[in-house]
């Protein structure tokens, strides 16, 4: 197995996932494509935790670029050992992966809390509140209750879809970073096995 190539694959995957997380989080600010709810502060409190922008997004780009950089050929040796520099880099990637685990973990936790609490919406009695908070997430299984939210239009579907996407993306990021921790430890201990002649496609 080539640890550098594996890291590069993980890095590229994380860049895509991070960009999707940022996009999903941004969409949460514009239910039904309207800006008024953000300006009136009629959005779920968990939207303001920036879990997709920061946790699953920007914080994920740091380890992603570290992992991509591991595959570069200009990694210098040390102490007369060609692979020593690459081994050090692989081990240092573990630290970057741990940052990724923290970011994706934050994204997953906030998305799960956002799903459990439900959206802030104008209910059928004209109250802006967390209409489904008291149902402890049971509203997710009982779609007939979603009509209790009258504004923003389709807010329950919007929130459930986007927080579910953030939950899934954050979960995948978490798993990939976990794989890179194992990959980095193995690559650092076992040595950098790829010769310059070997070519692998991700």
């Amino acid at each position: 197995m080539c640890y550098g190539k594996c890291a590069r694959c993980i890095g590229h995957s994380l860049v895509g996932l991070a960009l999707l997380c940022i996009a999903a989080n941004i969409l949460l600010y514009f239910p039904n494509g309207e800006t008024k709810y953000a300006s009136e502060n009629h959005l779920s409190r968990f939207v303001w935790f920036f879990s997709g922008i920061v946790g699953g997004g920007l914080l994920m780009l740091l380890p992603a670029f570290v992992f991509i950089g591991l595959e570069q050929d200009d990694c210098c040796g040390c102490c007369g050992h060609e692979n020593c520099g690459k081994r050090c880099a692989m081990l240092s990637s573990v630290l970057a992966a741990l940052i990724g685990i923290a970011g994706s973990g934050y994204c997953v936790i906030v998305a799960a809390l956002g799903l459990a609490e439900g959206p802030l919406c104008l209910d059928s009695l004209g109250q802006w509140n967390y209409t489904f908070a008291s149902t402890e997430g049971q509203y997710l299984l009982d779609t007939s209750t979603w009509s209790e939210c009258t504004e923003p239009k389709h807010i329950v579907e919007w929130n459930v879809s986007l927080f579910s996407i953030l939950l899934a993306l954050g979960g995948i990021e978490f798993i990939l970073c976990l794989i890179q921790v194992i990959n980095g430890v193995l690559g650092g201990i076992c040595g950098f096995c790829c010769s310059h002649q070997q070519q692998y496609d991700c």
Epitope: D123, S124, G126, S134, E148, T150, E151, P152
Partner: antibody, heavy 116, light 107 residues
């Protein structure tokens, strides 16, 4: 002070349609929900449906689907309910009620009498 | 549809007495319950929502309680203006059905 002014009593023939109006005045908020409720003489209350005039989200009791159509005009702050294919069973007082911010305001009711 | 059952159907009490009206839902409605008061020939008045929150302008002698399927409206000191019919209504999922009503008379 918020007031809901409903249109006057209606005497209609079976099979005909009638459009009831409910004009809201004194509102300081844009977001509110307008409900319609039916009450037959000396009986209980029956929820017909609601409309959010801002988002145009409507929800109607299945029992009244095909019978009641809820609409609203934001510019005149008026909600409408059209009742079609009227029968004697539709003879009742129809109330509009507006909910917002922990308050509910009810119109005075419109008496609809279906008679040949 | 969720069925709302009120009891008693009618009751008579003296001014100054405490009164309790109960409402039972046919399934769990959490705290999605409202109470209304209607006097003869008048429009209903909104009293309580979310089972225990008093609507604006409602006197504090009234209080709502309960959750899941069992709810009650309490009047701790009955006043003359409290006579009329009381209705409960759930607002958990549509249709938002009302209870049959409790007619309160003053002795």
């Amino acid at each position: 002070e918020v007031q809901l002014q409903q249109s006057g009593p209606e005497l209609v023939k079976p099979g005909a349609s009638v459009k009831l109006s409910c004009k809201a005045s004194g509102y300081t908020v844009t977001s509110y929900v307008m409900h319609w409720v039916k009450q037959k003489p000396g009986q209980g209350l029956e929820w017909i449906g609601y409309i959010n005039p801002y988002s145009d989200v409507t929800n109607c009791n299945e029992k009244f689907k095909g019978k009641a159509t809820l609409t609203s005009d934001k510019t005149s702050s008026t909600a409408y309910m059209e009742l079609s294919s009227l029968t004697s069973e539709d003879s009742a007082v129809y109330y509009c009620s507006s909910y917002g911010g922990g308050f509910a305001y009810w119109g005075q009711g419109t008496l609809v009498t279906v008679s040949a | 549809d969720i069925q709302m059952t009120q009891s008693p159907a009618s009751l008579s009490a003296s001014v100054g007495e405490p009164v309790t009206i109960t409402c039972r839902a046919s399934k769990n409605i959490y705290t999605y319950l409202a109470w209304y008061h209607q006097k003869q020939g008048k429009s209903p008045q909104f009293l309580v929502y979310n089972a225990r929150t008093l609507a604006g302008g409602v006197p504090s002698r009234l209080s709502g309680s309960g959750s899941v399927t069992q709810f009650s409206l309490n009047i701790n000191t009955l006043h003359r203006e409290d006579l009329g019919t009381y209705f409960c209504q759930h607002h958990y999922d549509t249709p938002y059905t009302f209870g049959g009503g409790t007619n309160l008379e003053i002795k």
